[in-house]
């Protein structure tokens, strides 16, 4: 799973970066890119590249930025209002039911099946039976011949929240 930055990961001068203050909270809430102070009187800005907040909030802290794992590429960096967007590297994908890691896409379909969908950052190649057109799911058994596929081009990103 993509890592979360801890304060210990940051150099002291980063941790001590000046906290910009804003005007008073509105009805007890601070806007995106800020968190509320302990006494509830101020909105304090998140630190770019370190933490963020996406909505109006009454949190005492901004959320830690996610760091993309090895095996992932960073599609967009963490800003004060949006978390890092990470995506599986070409040739790998992340499944809904196992989001903690990128898995290698299969290189081809089992014998008697044809490829109807490419490898994308969020799905393996899709294979269907030549005759029936029914989908094949699960591991590819050892086969004599496979229909090879080239990795798909990235489309919409897989965003991970911290």
């Amino acid at each position: 799973e993509s890592a979360l930055i801890t304060q210990q990961d940051l150099a002291p001068q980063q941790r001590a970066a000046p906290q910009q203050k804003r005007s008073s909270p509105s009805e007890g809430l601070c806007p995106p890119g800020h968190h509320i102070s302990e006494d509830g009187r101020d909105c304090i800005s998140c630190k770019y590249g370190q933490d963020y907040s996406t909505h109006w909030n009454d949190l005492l802290f901004c959320l830690r930025c996610t760091r993309c794992d090895s095996g992932e590429v960073e599609l967009s960096p963490c800003t004060t209002t949006r978390n890092t967007v990470c995506q599986c590297e070409e040739g790998t994908f992340r499944e809904e039911d196992s989001p903690e890691m990128c898995r290698k896409c299969r290189t081809g379909c089992p014998r008697g099946m044809v490829k109807v969908g490419d490898c994308t950052p969020w799905s393996d190649i899709e294979c269907v039976h030549k005759e029936s057109g029914t989908k094949h799911s699960g591991e590819v058994p050892a086969v004599e011949e496979t229909v090879t596929s080239s990795p798909g081009t990235p489309a919409s990103p897989c965003s991970l929240s911290g």
Epitope: Q7, E38, F61, S161
Partner: antibody
Framework: EVQLVESGGGLVQPGGSLKLSCAAS????????MSWVRQTPDKRLELVAL????????YNSDSVKGRFTISRDNARNTLYLQMSSLKSEDTAMYYC??????????WGQGTSVTVSS | DIVLTQSPASLPVSLGQRATISCRAS??????????IQWYRQKPGQPPKLLIY???NVDSEVPARFSGSGSGTDFSLYIHPVEEDDIAMYFC?????????FGGGTKLEIK
């Protein structure tokens, strides 16, 4: 290694005062928010007070509001809790804890406060 | 205040088995897809120690035997396999709203 060492606890009569201290070492004290958390004899944990890294902003729980004051001296790497108008229900082990984002990631060994006549 | 209810209050478990401790919040502790729930272990005579932050992130130097899950209002701490060293009180804590609050604790005991 992060170290937090509390002191100043003891036996005090109802209505009395105590000042707890927490000496911090092993990290850049002035860059972390800090807190006091107490644990009652029945083992329940209760947040008492919070303070930001520079000491300019504080929070006190309703149960101690107007009676307890959290403060810090970054030059001395020390956190304080001034307690006054003490009640029997303030009897607890008092821990100082470092705040890291959403969590309390390092705790001291605690100092015991007993309020009794 | 957000009330955290832990169950069970006491959990007898055999060494090597899996222990599951639950924590239910009186309202959601989510913010922007992040669950603001932490888990702590407190051994007898010691202060609490952070195990898990943001529901599922294992703190540094915490054994991989510990894991956490959940979202919204329902959270779980898992210990597998349970070791002798795990005899302790376990507490959940929320930081979604001030005051930050703690669960009442679960005492893990060896069968």
């Amino acid at each position: 290694e992060v170290q937090l060492v509390e002191s100043g606890g003891g036996l005090v009569q109802p209505g009395g005062s105590l000042k707890l201290s927490c000496a911090a070492s092993g990290f850049t004290f002035s860059t972390y928010g800090m807190s006091w958390v107490r644990q009652t004899p029945d083992k329940r944990l209760e947040l008492v007070a919070l303070i930001n890294s520079q000491g300019g902003s504080t929070y006190n729980s309703d149960s101690v509001k107007g009676r307890f004051t959290i403060s810090r001296d970054n030059a001395r790497n020390t956190l304080y809790l001034q307690m006054s108008s003490l009640k029997s229900e303030d009897t607890a082990m008092y821990y100082c804890a470092r705040r890291d984002y959403e969590s309390l990631d390092s705790w001291g060994q605690g100092t015991s406060v007993t309020v009794s006549s | 205040d957000i009330v955290l209810t832990q169950s069970p209050a006491s959990l007898p478990v055999s060494l090597g088995q899996r222990a599951t401790i639950s924590c239910r919040a009186s309202e959601s502790v989510e913010y922007s897809g992040t669950s603001l729930i932490q888990w702590y272990r407190q051994k007898p005579g010691q202060p609490p120690k952070l195990l898990i932050y943001a529901a599922s992130n294992v703190d540094s130097e915490v054994p991989a035997r510990f894991s956490g899950s959940g979202s919204g209002t329902d959270f779980s701490l898992y210990i597998h396999p349970v070791e002798e060293d795990d005899i302790a009180m376990y507490f959940c804590q929320q930081s979604r709203k001030v005051p930050w609050t703690f669960g009442g604790g679960t005492k893990l005991e060896i069968k």
